[in-house]
Interface confidence: low
């Protein structure tokens, strides 16, 4: 059964998915698709990585984490009710039927108040950094992703501000994780 994640209309939704690359720079292809994971590949692909790069993505779908270290969590920007549904994160491990498949259910709720887009963007860009720093060494050795500069005080402040929000609940550390190699 799929894990459920929630976001409000106008927010950025975060769908966690992780794996541990066997070696630095030796990545496993990953695809994200709308709809439950089929037998092979992803249906309705919204984003794809190969052994090196994010090589395909569509508008509003991003990887904000350090995908080179296995954080392939999906961010969906400025969600609408139509974004509700099942999403498939597929870690495409070489070999027949070796793929790891994770189905994540996204539930979009109507906005209670008018969202502040700029502020929301800052929040959702910050949290993936906080999560992906775990076990990855100091922030200055992180690889690319156009992440904002943020210190522990800012993270603590953001966490306090979001403690009671649905977003904070969505960011709980229960994402799909797999170790390879």
């Amino acid at each position: 059964s799929e894990v459920e994640y929630r976001a409000e209309v106008g927010q950025n939704a975060y769908l966690p998915c992780f794996y541990t690359p066997a070696a630095p720079g030796n990545l496993v292809p990953v695809c994200w698709g709308k709809g439950a994971c089929p037998v092979f590949e992803c249906g309705n692909v919204v984003l794809r990585t190969d052994e090196r790069d994010v090589n395909y993505w569509t508008s509003r779908y991003w990887l904000n984490g350090d995908f080179r270290k296995g954080d392939v969590s999906l961010t969906i920007e400025n969600v609408t009710l139509a974004d509700s549904g099942i999403y498939c994160c597929r870690i495409q491990i070489p070999g027949i039927m070796n793929d790891e498949k994770f189905n994540l259910k996204l539930v979009i709720k109507p906005a209670k108040v008018t969202p502040a887009p700029t502020r929301q963007r800052d929040f959702t860009a910050a949290f993936p950094r906080m999560l992906t720093t775990r076990g990855h060494g100091p922030a200055e050795t992180q690889t690319l992703g156009s992440l904002p500069d943020i210190n522990l005080t800012q993270i603590s402040t953001l966490a306090n501000e979001l403690r009671d929000s649905r977003l904070a609940n969505d960011l709980r550390d229960s994402g799909a994780t797999i170790r390879i190699g």
Epitope: G25, T49, D53, A125
Partner: antibody, heavy 119, light 107 residues
Framework: EVQLQQLGAELVKPGASVKISCKAS????????MDWVKQSHGESLEWIGD????????SYNQKFKGKATLTVDKSSSTAYMELRSLTSEDTAVYYC????????????WGQGTSLTVSS | TWGMTQTTSSLSASLGDRVTISCRAS??????LNWYQQKPDGTVKLLIY???RLYSGVPSRFTGSGSGTDYSLTISNLEQEDIATYFC?????????FGAGTKLELK
């Protein structure tokens, strides 16, 4: 055709600030990060930082924090770099360069803006 | 900051020569190594990315190789238009860093 258009030269007095522009065309501006690179005296290249126009998120080289501020105007597909408290050390050619999302290389470069700081 | 060293600052060669330019990283950069060409007028172009991938529109006489900390760019049959300065750049870690450049001149 992808183009990154920069002004050829700027002459500024020490202590002043300057805002260098980079107008992008030929692609969807928000689909790529815009990076800035410094080249002093025709020598090596130094990465200053980047801005992701889609998220307005930034990464800076620690060396240039407090010196450079990166911004974008999405309506005109233009990236800006403001340099403050200018000294002769800031005299250089400054390039804007396009970097694909998730990529680590710059696939298109502006022609560079030559900044001279002199009284 | 991860240092990138191009030990040869200038190199003289003749048209038709095979030229190799080297670049060394201070640590393993996992093949995240890119090469750029800068013409005398300041124009910069991407040649090779991820060590050995030829960028679109770049002539096949340019090839890249290497792994770990040691990388090289080879021009198999030097042409007049190749006279330029060549920079390597690591993309493994922020901040992105460049080599000092190797200026290629005609003998």
């Amino acid at each position: 055709e992808v183009q990154l258009q920069q002004l050829g030269a700027e002459l500024v007095k020490p202590g002043a600030s300057v805002k260098i522009s980079c107008k992008a065309s030929g692609y969807i501006f928000t689909d790529y990060s815009m990076d800035w690179v410094k080249q002093s005296h025709g020598e090596s290249l130094e990465w200053i930082g980047d801005i992701n126009p889609n998220y307005d998120s930034l990464s800076y080289n620690q060396k240039f924090k407090g010196k450079a501020t990166l911004t974008v105007d999405k309506s005109s597909s233009t990236a800006y770099m403001e340099l403050r408290s200018l000294t002769s050390e800031d005299t250089a050619v400054y390039y804007c360069a396009r970097r694909g999302y998730g990529k680590d290389y710059f696939d298109f470069w502006g022609q560079g803006t030559s900044l001279t700081v002199s009284s | 900051t991860w240092g990138m060293t191009q030990t040869t600052s200038s190199l003289s060669a003749s048209l038709g020569d095979r030229v190799t330019i080297s670049c060394r990283a201070s640590q393993d950069i996992s093949n995240y190594l890119n090469w750029y060409q800068q013409k005398p007028d300041g124009t910069v172009k991407l040649l090779i990315y991820h060590t050995s991938r030829l960028y679109s529109g770049v002539p096949s006489r340019f090839t890249g190789s290497g792994s770990g900390t040691d990388y090289s760019l080879t021009i198999s049959n030097l042409e007049q238009e190749d006279i330029a300065t060549y920079f390597c750049q690591q993309g493994n870690t922020l901040p992105l860093t460049f080599g000092a450049g190797t200026k290629l001149e005609l003998k």
